[in-house]
Every structure is written in C-alpha cells, then in structure tokens.
C-alpha cells in the first residue's frame, strides 16, 4: 500500500491556444486530468488501472502552480494504491480548458483539450522527487513525481506491514525496511521478552519487565545468585537451596551448637590457656598465681602456708611475712628455741632430740602435720584435682568430683573419642561433641585416613552427574563442583524439596 505523488510546478501556454490551434476566449482557463496505469511499452488509451485524479482550474494560459500540501490543498496530487508497487508505471497528463464551471468530461466540448503528455518507465519507492519537463509545439509542462509507502507499510514495494507498538504483544518501532527494532530493554522475535537486570542468574532469576531480577524459590540476592539456607540454620551456609552446612566450630543440625567455645567466648581470664573439650565445654590452664574454673581468682602467697611451727602469714605487697609463735624464729619460723624438755609436740606427736639437744623434731601421728604436729591434715590444700575438679575431704582420705568430660582419680584424664588414636597414617584427631573427625595428611583420605590416595585425586573420576572435579593440592583430595540440581560430596544426589516446608 502506497501513494504515487505528482507535483505540478509550471505550465506555459504563451499564445493561449487549444491543441487544435484555436485560441481560448478570453484565455485558456486550465485544469489537469491525470491517469496512472501499469507499464505499457506504447502508452495507449484504456483503463487507468492504478488510478485517476483531476484538479480544479489552476490558472490561465501560463502559470506556476504553488505547493498547496501544507494548506490541505491538492498539490502534490495523490494517487493511492492498495497493492505491492510493481516498480514500473505509465502516466498520462492532460491539460484542459474549462469554458464554464462544470469540469466533468461529458460537459466539455471535445476540442477543449490544450495538451496531452504520456510517459512510462521504472520508479523505485523513495522520498526523492524525480523532476521532468515535457514540451510540445505550443506548451511546456514542468512537474515532479515520486512513490512513497502509506503509514505502517515498508520495504522496496510497500508490501511489508509494520505498526509500532508498546504493549503486551510487543515493544518495538519499525525500521525503514519494515523489520522490527526493539525498544530498549526488550528482545525476542516480537520484542516481547524483557531483558533482565544485568547479571541476573539465568536459571535462578527471571523478570517480567526490563532491568528486573525476580528470584525463583530457594534463591535470594540482587542477582538471585545466593541460595537460601534451611530455615533455622544459625551458623551455616548453603550451596544449593534449603541446605545448612556448618561453619567451622559449629555443630548440630542447625549449626547452633558451639564446638569452639574458646574462640567464640574467650572464657579464660588472666592469660590462661583455653582448650575446647566438647559442646559448650572448655578447660582453662591457669598461669602461676591464678586459680578458679576460669582462672579468675588471684592466688595469695599465703595460700601455700609458708609459715611453719604455727606461724601466722600476713600478705604484703612485695610478698608475705611470718609472725612466729613463742619459741620460734626465722623467715618461715623454721628455727626453734625449744627442746624436747618443753614438750613442743602436740596431738600425740613424739619428740626426738637433734644436735645434742639444741634442736628437736616431732614425729606426728596420722592426720596431723606441721613442725609441732599442730595442723590437722587437709588433703585438699594442695589442689590435687586437675581440670577444674572439686576436692572433697572424706575423713582420712579425699576424692575428686570431676567436671563433665574428665575422669581419673585426679580428673587428669580427658574422656575422648580420640583416646584410642582412631586416625591412621598420622591423621590428627579432633574431638566433637557428637563424634570425632580426622584431618588426614597429604596422600591419605577416608573417615579414618585409612585410604591412600594418588596425587591426582580427580584421576578416578569421583564426581557424578557431570560435576567438575578439582584437586585440592594442599591435601591431595578432590572437590566436586555440582551442576544445578545436584548435591553431595560427589554430586551423587538430586535435590528434592519437601512440600511440607513453607519456604
């Protein structure tokens, strides 16, 4: 579909005569009839197959025809067609004299014709005007013409229909050749497919309008490339949705159990050394001068009972001082001015002379001690219970009440799954609250480091479901990078999402 446009520019009839040579009275009031038809080698009369058009009287004798298109007038003349433009045409332009106001062919005398021109040729669709001039013995006509496509028609023959749109069915404008040109943010054959936010994950994200990234279930983040861990997962991550893989130092199904209390809470005070001993369990090894479960108590220098023979100890800033009872002297009241004659031994102790009677020594009965057998034995004084165990006096004996995770007479033994050295080939054993874990040296693997592995851990193709295998050069083990939809250390398990979970 298109329009053949004819622009009449100038008509010259200086003598004001008709084609017959007879002059017009009073002058030649001139109008034009145009016939457009298919190509003929010799243009002959007959139907105007492409269309006809007539003008009103445009002038008398010689005149210029002004461009009247802007004012809604009839120049250029429009000859619309509703078919594919064939690229060739024939054109007949007749100039007529109108004696009266009726311009119909039947109302005119046959000799009212002033001039007739006929041309034919090829004409391509385009915006450029072709200028032509036709001269006869008495008249001259200057004109130009072109063929353009109707609105929404494109291509060399105006045969390609394209109507720009921006709705659910497409988002495009039309190129000069009639092909679609998508509006920014749209793609696809009919520009119906939005271009998502740059970087939006192909599988895990989608969009309904340009520059958007909406996440499919189980994924989150601006680009939908972060999986959502299992609801309730505390100190864990995921590689596929709804997993919960514990961070270092955490255990339990939801990674909410502290396996590294020392690092996470630093419970030991005053520079003490902390050792993890299971879930929420630890042991502090105190520096000299400190005691208590968390080494929070400062030991007094008098706690070691340095004063002998019943001397009383007084703490001082720079140490301690012994106040000796009568008959004793020295830094620790260790020297006596008494002899066995003074009956210095208490609680049934036996006195023995020393240095020819200048000194003595007491031999104490059970449960008493001291230079003069003056002290009842407190078997807990020496803090014999290790690892924070509580010492209990039981008459002549004592016993240790151990903290969880320890055993033995003095709580010196750590109850440990690692005690039986389960890790082979020099593997390092780690106690966990709910089991043990072996860290294997290079060249070994397996739950207990019992499997000798080759240097290229991927040589045996251990990964399933087209997963990519990587060799960890530091441990000679392999890591499987699973494709979407598979999990497991070897990517052997397809992911299944239970319908009973709301997420």
């Amino acid at each position: 579909s298109g329009v053949f446009q004819l622009q009449l520019q100038e008509f010259i009839n200086e003598r004001g005569v008709l084609a017959s040579g007879r002059p017009c009275e009073p002058g030649c009031r001139t109008f034009f009839r145009v016939c457009l038809k298919h190509f003929q080698a010799v243009v002959s009369p007959g139907p105007c197959t492409f269309g006809t058009v007539s003008t009103p009287v445009l002038g008398t004798n010689s005149f210029a025809v002004r461009d009247d298109s802007s004012g809604g007038g009839r120049n250029p003349l429009q000859l619309p067609f509703n078919f594919t433009w064939p690229g060739t045409f024939s054109l007949i332009i007749e100039a007529w004299h109108a004696p009266g106001d009726d311009l119909r062919p039947e109302a005119l005398p046959p000799d009212a014709l002033i001039s007739k021109i006929a041309i034919q040729g090829s004409l391509a669709v385009g915006q450029n005007w072709l200028l032509d001039e036709q001269t006869s013995t008495l008249t001259r006509l200057r004109y130009s013409y072109r063929v353009i496509c109707s609105d929404n028609y494109y291509g060399d023959n105006c045969s390609r229909l394209c109507k720009k749109r921006n709705d659910h069915f497409g988002h495009y404008v039309c190129q000069p050749d009639g092909n679609l040109s998508c509006l920014p943010g749209w793609t696809g054959e009919y520009c119906q497919q939005p271009i998502c936010l740059s970087g939006c994950h192909e599988q895990n994200g989608y969009c309904s309008k340009p520059a958007e990234c909406l996440c499919r279930p189980g994924w989150q983040g601006r680009l939908c490339n972060e999986c959502i861990p299992h609801n309730g997962c505390r100190h864990g991550t995921c590689s596929t949705p709804w997993q919960c893989t514990c961070d270092e130092g955490w255990g339990g199904l939801f990674c909410d159990q502290d396996l590294n209390y020392c690092t996470h809470h630093s419970p030991c005070k005053n520079g003490a050394t902390c050792s993890n001993s299971g879930q929420r369990s630890y042991t502090c090894t105190c520096r000299p001068g400190y005691t208590g479960v968390d080494c929070e108590l400062e030991l007094s220098e008098c706690d070691s009972n340095p004063c002998r023979n019943g001397g009383s100890c007084k703490d001082q800033e720079d140490g301690y001082h012994c106040l000796c009872p009568p008959g004793y002297y020295g830094l620790h009241c260790e020297h006596s001015t008494l002899s066995c004659a003074d009956s210095p031994c208490f609680n049934g102790g036996s006195c023995r002379e020393r240095n020819q009677g200048a000194n003595y020594a007491c031999e104490c009965p059970p449960n008493f001690t001291g230079s003069n057998c003056e002290k009842k034995v407190d078997r807990c004084t020496s803090n014999p219970c290790a690892n924070g165990g509580q010492c209990l006096n039981r008459g002549p004996s004592r016993m240790c009440r151990c903290r969880p995770g320890f055993t033995g007479t003095y709580c010196e033994l750590h109850v440990s799954d690692c005690a039986r050295n389960p890790c082979a080939h020099g593997g390092t054993c780690h106690d966990l609250e709910n089991g043990l874990m072996c860290t294997c040296p290079a060249g070994f693997s397996g739950r207990r480091c019992e499997v000798r592995t080759s240097i290229d851990a991927c040589a045996s193709s251990p990964c399933f479901n087209r997963a990519t295998c990587y060799t960890d050069l530091s441990t000679d083990t392999f890591v499987c990078n699973c494709p979407y939809g598979f999990v497991g250390s070897r990517c052997e398990f397809p992911v299944g999402l239970p319908p009973s979970f709301p997420w």
């Epitope: 919960c244 255990g251 990674c255 966990l432 739950r447």
Partner: nanobody
Framework: EVQLVESGGGLVQPGGSLRLSCAAS????????IGWFRQAPGKEPEGIGC????????YYADSVKGRFTISRDNAKNTVYLQMNSLKPEDTAVYYC?????????????WGQGTQVTVSS
C-alpha cells in the same frame, strides 16, 4: 536418590510415649549421621538431637534431654526416636534429616515428616 521416610506419628496423651522410625535409602547408611528436628505451626524448626554415623555419639536439645532417645540400626538402615513423658508443647511435625557426612553438622536432606499431637 536420597530418601528419608518417617513413620510412627499420631495422637498421644500427655505423659505418654511414642516411637518414631526413619527408614533411609539411596546412600551408604552407616557413612552418615542422622538427626531429628521438629516444627510446630508458625514456629522455626528446632533441632531435637542427632546420632553419629557409628552410633557412638549422640546429642540432644535441652528441651528433650532425659525424655527422648535416638538410636540406629545400621543393618536395617533405620533410625529411631523414642519419646517418653510427652508434653503438649512437643506437638509438631517431626522430620528426620542427615547432613550428608559422618558428624552431626548441618542438614542436606530430610524427609516429608510425621505429625505428633500430644493432647488429652
């Protein structure tokens, strides 16, 4: 394909007992730790306890300690949750799960769940 199927749920009176079973398939059963968690309507899931791959190590949440016991029969590829002295607050859907490793550290697979209702 890893599959965990729970059974044994139902309605029980306060103070009563119930034993849940979890039948496993699709993996080497004695390589993986197995645990139980539960979820009451409108609440976050709560880990109940777990048993290591060998069965030598178990742990329990404080809320069920002394009342619930987890055991496993590697010959039958089954884990059990024995629940005694049940309380109304134990009402939930109970799921068995595995981290996919020998120690109880996380969740990678879980079953469809079985409903336990404690009510008089």
């Amino acid at each position: 394909e890893v599959q965990l199927v729970e059974s044994g749920g139902g309605l029980v009176q306060p103070g009563g007992s119930l034993r849940l079973s979890c039948a496993a398939s699709g993996f080497t059963f004695d390589d993986y730790a197995i645990g139980w968690f539960r979820q009451a309507p409108g609440k976050e899931p709560e880990g109940i306890g777990c048993i290591s791959s060998s069965g030598g190590s178990t742990y329990y949440a404080d809320s069920v300690k002394g009342r619930f016991t987890i055991s496993r029969d590697n010959a039958k590829n089954t884990v059990y949750l024995q629940m005694n002295s049940l309380k109304p607050e134990d009402t939930a859907v109970y799921y068995c799960a595995t981290p996919g490793i020998a120690a109880c550290r996380g969740i990678h697979y879980w079953g469809q769940g079985t409903q336990v209702t404690v009510s008089s």
